[in-house]
């Protein structure tokens, strides 16, 4: 039975040209996290494997940085980065947990940022 829950940064906004941290946290389960995948709609951005470490998609290497923790940092944001992002936790024995974040990249010089996410 899957008892875990994923907390995310939720809906966030950032300024064009800036950077943003996408963060998820899996709680309420003792399942072992074997891998976390970060996806943007139909594209895999990065993988953090518990045994093998971080691996960034070659097509995003110049704009995506691993961390902090199991989070992901997006840099040099463009309006095309607006959209849904997913953190997918592969766990044993529970299976897969998915968290969703919506990022809006704003043209204006003032972007309202969502509440800063902290891992308890």
């Amino acid at each position: 039975m899957m008892t875990g829950t994923i907390e995310t940064t939720g809906n966030i906004s950032a300024e064009k040209g800036g950077s943003i941290i996408l963060q998820c946290h899996l709680s309420s389960t003792t399942a072992q996290v074997t891998q976390v995948n970060w996806e943007q709609q139909d594209q895999l951005l990065a993988i953090c494997n518990a045994d093998l470490g971080w691996h960034i998609s070659p097509s995003f290497k110049d704009r995506v940085a691993p961390g902090p923790g199991l989070g992901l940092t997006l840099q040099s944001l463009t309006v095309n980065d607006t959209g849904e992002y997913f953190c997918i936790y592969h766990t044993y024995p529970d299976g897969t947990y998915t968290g969703r974040i919506f990022l809006e990249v704003l043209e204006s010089s003032v972007a309202e940022h969502g509440a800063r996410f902290q891992i308890p």
């Epitope: 074997t34 891998q35 995948n37 996806e39 139909d42 594209q43 895999l44 993988i47 494997n49 045994d51 093998l52 470490g53 691996h55 960034i56 998609s57 070659p58 097509s59 592969h90």
Partner: antibody
Framework: EVQLVQSGAEVKKPGASVKVSCKAS????????IEWVRQAPGQRLEWMGV????????NYKEKFKGRVTITADKSSSTAYMELSSLRSEDTAVYYC??????????WGQGTTVTVSS | DIVMTQSPDSLAVSLGERATINCKAS??????VAWYQHKPGQSPKLLIY???YRYTGVPDRFSGSGSGTDFTLTISSLQAEDVAVYYC?????????FGGGTKVEIK
Amino acid sequence: EVQLVQSGAEVKKPGASVKVSCKASGYAFTNYLIEWVRQAPGQRLEWMGVINPGSGGTNYKEKFKGRVTITADKSSSTAYMELSSLRSEDTAVYYCARGEYFFFDYWGQGTTVTVSS
Amino acid sequence: DIVMTQSPDSLAVSLGERATINCKASQHVSNGVAWYQHKPGQSPKLLIYSASYRYTGVPDRFSGSGSGTDFTLTISSLQAEDVAVYYCQQHYNTPHTFGGGTKVEIK
């Protein structure tokens, strides 16, 4: 030029072990994964396991756990795959490959392992 | 484990014609699929990674598409040197499973 050069063909008896080497050159050995894949006669390619030479971290396919050991020697830029308790079904060509983001961009020439009594 | 099912098992195409190979994943793999060409007596060669990105030096007659669970490798104009077995592989999660292969021949 990136190259992965594997050790030569081996003939082993059932129950024995085999250790295949894979010497890397032409790139920073610790910046990429080394993956091991085999192909038995008439079968599909089968992924066996992987090592991160930088950290030493490994990940193995469940069916090989306890029978396979993958190691890496940073000083010689060489990875090793040891398979124990050999049986006839382990007769195959064994490949090492450089792992970039978990796909395999350079492959060794392959090492034929024959298990026969 | 994620099962990769390729179709067809074999394909005979006339020189200059299009060859299409399909690969279906048993569960979501995003765009985490690579395609390899394997000729007898040689090591496999990477053609496509992340479903649609052509690897360095691969001729542009090779293209890949798909996301989620359904993927396609297309050879737009088959050449004699393209005779080989083609494999899909998911690089989404360990173990990194391969499809059963598709043998491409000249008709």
